[in-house]
């Protein structure tokens, strides 16, 4: 049997026998275009493609539509994988989304959605989510039904205020909604009473900016 040489996601890499977490090269569906991603092969059975990570504020997340489309940052640290790749990937098969959160008091929580996909760019990478479970709130901190993605130069939210400009970062803003994991990073002791921080309302409430976040996806049938 010929060995697989291209992989569409980290689950395929894991199943090929490569089970160490790290940076791997993925290939766009139905294309030869490649992208580098961090694969988490340890959490919950492994095979997770990390699509977002925040940990120290080293990367500026107040980026343009094009940058959020194509991705930015470093897969070894803070980064955004890219809306176009995630849209194409999640449009082909059913994926689950796991969001891991850390606060500044040493607590961790997660939200797991049993079906996640992004619409195409023509629909502003609108997010679709169903089936929430987990410890980071019984109500979804990503507004339901899903919103279009907005950035500082592409305002697609439901607010007259331009949420991305006001709150910082590209996100699926409603008007503006209960979350923004791409907000301004605030260090410890400066992370409360912040209107534009890294927000997940149904875990930490208003004005609390989180220490670390990871968004990762995996095929539902993994």
């Amino acid at each position: 049997k010929e060995e697989q040489t291209t992989f569409r996601d980290c689950a395929e890499i894991f199943k090929s026998g490569l089970t160490t977490s790290g940076i791997y090269t993925l290939t766009f569906p139905n294309s030869t275009e490649e992208i580098k991603a961090y694969c988490d092969m340890d959490v919950g059975g492994g095979g997770w493609t990390v699509i977002q990570h925040r940990e120290d504020g080293s990367v500026d997340f107040q980026r343009t539509w094009k940058e959020y489309k194509e991705g930015f940052g470093s897969p070894l640290g803070e980064y955004w994988l890219g809306n176009e790749f995630v849209s194409q990937l999640t449009g082909q098969h059913r994926y689950v989304l796991k969001i891991q959160l850390k606060d500044w008091e040493g607590n961790e929580a997660h939200s797991l959605y049993d079906h996640f996909y992004l619409a195409g760019e023509e629909s502003n990478y609108r997010i679709h989510l169903t089936g929430l479970t987990g410890t980071a709130g019984k109500i979804s901190s990503i507004s339901q039904p899903g919103s279009d993605f907005s950035t500082k130069d592409s305002d697609n939210d439901k607010c007259i205020c331009k949420c991305s400009q006001m709150l910082s970062g590209g996100w699926w803003f409603d008007a503006c909604g209960p979350s923004n994991l791409n907000g301004q990073y605030y260090p410890q002791k400066q992370n409360t009473n912040k209107f534009n921080g890294i927000k997940w309302y149904y875990w930490k409430g208003s004005g609390y900016s989180l220490k670390a976040t990871t968004m990762m996806i995996r095929p539902a049938d993994f």
């Epitope: 439901k158 607010c159 205020c161 006001m166 503006c176 209960p178 209107f195 208003s206 004005g207």
Partner: nanobody
Framework: EVQLVESGGGLVQAGGSLRLSCAVS????????IGWFRQAPGKEREGVSC????????YYADSVKGRFTISSDNAKNTVYLQMNSLKPEDTAAYYC???????????????????????WGQGTQVTVSS
């Protein structure tokens, strides 16, 4: 430092009136929304009313429409909630909260959702006796 200080609560008989005040300072916004919320013992906090500093647009919960009036004095950085025809079911701790100018495009009103407010006061108690 952002501060929201409520005052004006107290004990009043059913059918009476109270005026709550919310003094606001240090907000990091040019335009903003101030909301009034209330929480009765053993119940969820609920949005009562809100007002936008930029255009004065307002929202009222159905339970207080026609009885409560929200207003603002921008010169004093104070928002008021005039509460008339009070009922025993209005008994609660009343909180004012502040957030950015999150005005919904569809409704053109401010939000009654807690998560749209970033800063909160300590609350003032309103008790309506029958």
């Amino acid at each position: 430092e952002v501060q929201l200080v409520e005052s004006g609560g107290g004990l009043v008989q059913a059918g009476g009136s109270l005026r709550l005040s919310c003094a606001v300072s240090g907000l990091p916004f040019d335009d903003y929304v101030i909301g009034w919320f209330r929480q009765a013992p053993g119940k969820e906090r609920e949005g009562v009313s809100c007002i936008s500093s930029s255009d004065g647009s307002t929202y009222y919960a159905d339970s207080v429409k026609g009885r409560f009036t929200i207003s603002s004095d921008n010169a004093k950085n104070t928002v008021y909630l005039q509460m008339n025809s009070l009922k025993p079911e209005d008994t609660a701790a009343y909180y004012c909260a502040a957030g950015g100018p999150r005005i919904n495009i569809a409704t053109m009103t401010c939000s009654h959702d807690e998560y749209e407010y970033d800063y909160w006061g300590q609350g003032t108690q309103v008790t309506v006796s029958s």
